[in-house]
Amino acid sequence: HTAAQDNCTCPTNKMTVCSPDGPGGRCQCRALGSGMAVDCSTLTSKCLLLKARMSAPKNARTLVRPSEHALVDNDGLYDPDCDPEGRFKARQCNQTSVCWCVNSVGVRRTDKGDLSLRCDELVRTHHILIDLRHRPTAGAFNHSDLDAELRRLFRERYRLHPKFVAAVHYEQPTIQIELRQNTSQKAAGDVDIGDAAYYFERDIKGESLFQGRGGLDLRVRGEPLQVERTLIYYLDEIPPKFSMKRLT
């Protein structure tokens, strides 16, 4: 795994500890919490980041209306089980043997159950809708400038292939970024939209995961874009399975 050789640090993940004990005596960076070696040339998976974090310490016109199956991460933080590749395991359980199924971004997609609960497969989140409200500005941002800046951000900062940024919608003060990535579209080496969205979410909250970089300084034609609230909706390839009790 690549890491900055000169001073043995991980540019893409500050929640790591790096030491020169990797293959060939090279620098190797391990994610806190799991101890798994991470590839510092790309984003670390959300599962490993959550594990590290736990260990360390509408008005729609041009805007998209989330579908009835869209999930919002209401459960907050938990210490996840990650598979050997650092992805979320389909079934997550807590210390009290309460279990639930999650999607590929680690968001619960079933009612909670006991240890007998089965989660046959990890269901892929193929569509992410990032809903932002920006602080008041003198005037509205130019839509095409805003679109270009956000696409540049996801391409350069999060290394997400441009084809996965499906659309940027804007109706002042609401900005919506749509990320789409089907299983068949994601090639080896491609950043996962779930990981990009998580890095973006942490950046927006002023909790950047990048090593030593300043916080996110978003500007559109020199004008600061300051976000005052964020909502992220997750749509899975297979709709979630919640009981009617929860839906009411």
Epitope: V17, P23, A37
Partner: antibody, heavy 115, light 107 residues
Framework: QVQLQQSGAELVRPGTSVKISCKAS????????LGWVKQRPGHGLEWIGN????????NYNEKFKGKAILTADTSSSTAYMQLSSLTSEDSGVYFC????????WGQGTTLTVSS | DILLTQSPAILSVSPGERVSFSCRAS??????IHWYQQRTNGFPRLLIK???ESISGIPSRFSGSGSGTDFTLSINSVESEDIADYYC?????????FGSGTKLEIK
């Protein structure tokens, strides 16, 4: 050359605590993980946990949580392992080793818990 | 936790023979496996790191191979000084774990 020098053998009473030391030399102490391993007579090797002296990060084998506490003093390049509420099951040889590949080991500290 | 299964528990060979030790991981761990030799009353000594990387000062008769879940340590011509216990260890993720060991005996 890299060396890890452990403290001497200990004979202690059940219910008490003990603190074993591991002094590192020949490398930058704060750049590597330092692990601890237990071996009971006739048994294999058991990983207790590790510490990264450069940041004070620690990890523990679930089995040793509440039993072992790992600390490090960067000024003296010394790692410590405190074992508490000792029973006969804690008797054995304890090794420190530089990680994650355990390329250098201490000579071992024999702990005997007996009344 | 990652379980490492070593087999056989005891290997008995004649001097000059080639011998192989097996270590199987309960999940894919890439090449994050290391091999150690421990003589009676001694501390473990690193023989091979990352499945196949040789270690300075270790005789060339020791070699390692494998990736994923199946790993092998080989001694191509056993000598009497090789009588010891041999352990594999994974550094893929915490908690690090060791195999139960294989005892090498000379006939």
């Amino acid at each position: 050359q890299v060396q890890l020098q452990q403290s001497g053998a200990e004979l202690v009473r059940p219910g008490t605590s003990v603190k074993i030391s591991c002094k590192a030399s020949g490398y930058t102490f704060t750049n590597y993980w330092l692990g601890w391993v237990k071996q009971r007579p006739g048994h294999g090797l058991e990983w207790i946990g590790n510490i990264f002296p450069g940041g004070g990060y620690t990890n523990y084998n679930e089995k040793f949580k509440g039993k072992a506490i790992l600390t490090a003093d960067t000024s003296s390049s010394t790692a410590y392992m405190q074992l508490s509420s000792l029973t006969s099951e804690d008797s054995g040889v304890y090794f420190c080793a530089r990680e994650g590949v355990m390329d250098y080991w201490g000579q071992g500290t024999t702990l005997t818990v007996s009344s | 936790d990652i379980l490492l299964t070593q087999s056989p528990a005891i290997l008995s060979v004649s001097p000059g023979e080639r011998v192989s030790f097996s270590c199987r991981a309960s999940q894919n761990i890439g090449t994050s496996i290391h091999w150690y030799q421990q003589r009676t009353n001694g501390f473990p000594r690193l023989l091979i790191k990352y499945a196949s990387e040789s270690i300075s000062g270790i005789p060339s008769r020791f070699s390692g191979s494998g990736s994923g879940t199946d790993f092998t340590l080989s001694i191509n011509s056993v000598e009497s000084e090789d009588i010891a216990d041999y352990y594999c260890q994974q550094s893929y993720s915490w908690p690090f774990t060791f195999g139960s060991g294989t005892k090498l005996e000379i006939k």
